[in-house]
């Protein structure tokens, strides 16, 4: 019987060209984790297995890096990193738990480029 | 589950080439990263090559030129072309693969032995 609940960060945002935190926890369960996976929509992002360790997929490397703990960063964020975002923990013996996180990415804010113009 | 079945190892000659295959069957849906680890006597389990389904491709620097990953989507099947081998290059490959949602799976393991 599957007894665990996953908490995620949920919707989250973030500017253009910066960076974020993916952040899954799996609690009320004594479940041992084998691994957890990183996918977005139809894409995987990393995984971090018990024995290899974190593993990156090479269409990431370059803007994803593991943690903290079993969360990911994803870094130089563009537009179209927008959508949804699964950490799918796999467990022994309860099985597999998927949490969801909404990220939208945003343009710079208007305050953050009107602050570097003087008004007359 | 996912299953791989891996072929092509054996004993070749410094300078040689060969190819090792690896086929994945079972749940095979969705993107995934396929590739070979090795290990060598004594010594620790090593990326060697992986691939994903849209084809990105990375290797070990002391394989890089000598070494191509390549896959059929179509057959499921990751292949490891190695040419310009070493006596350093013997060892144990695995295939090893994750497909979307899924586990890590491990191939059994085929030697390659690189040898005059």
């Known amino acids: 019987m599957m007894t665990g609940t996953i908490e995620t960060t949920g919707n989250i945002s973030a500017e253009k060209g910066g960076s974020i935190i993916l952040q899954c926890h799996l609690s009320s369960t004594t479940a041992q984790v084998t691994q957890v996976n990183w996918e977005q929509q139809d894409q995987l992002l990393a995984i971090c297995n018990a024995d290899l360790g974190w593993h990156i997929s090479p269409s990431f490397k370059d803007r994803v890096a593991p943690g903290p703990g079993l969360g990911l960063t994803l870094q130089s964020l563009t537009v179209n990193d927008t959508g949804e975002y699964f950490c799918i923990y796999h467990t022994y013996p309860d099985g597999t738990y998927t949490g969801r996180i909404f990220l939208e990415v945003l343009e710079s804010s208007v305050a953050e480029h009107g602050a570097r113009f003087q008004i007359p | 589950e996912v299953q791989l079945v891996e072929s092509g190892g054996g004993l070749v000659q410094p300078g040689g080439s060969l190819r090792l295959s690896c086929a994945a069957s079972?749940?095979?849906?969705?993107?995934?990263?396929m590739g070979w680890f090795r290990q060598a006597p004594g010594k620790e389990r090593e990326l060697v090559a992986e691939?994903?389904?849209?084809?990105?491709?990375n290797y070990a620097d002391s394989v890089k030129g000598r070494f191509t990953i390549s896959a059929d989507n179509s057959k499921n099947t990751a292949y490891l072309q190695m040419n310009s081998l070493k006596p350093e290059d013997t060892a144990v490959y695995y295939c090893?693969?994750?497909?979307?949602?899924?586990?890590?799976?491990w191939g059994q393991g085929t030697l390659v032995t690189v040898s005059s």
């Open positions: 090893a693969a994750v497909f979307s949602r899924g586990p890590l799976t």
């Open positions: 079972g749940r095979t849906f969705g993107d995934y990263i």
């Open positions: 691939i994903t389904r849209s084809g990105r491709t």
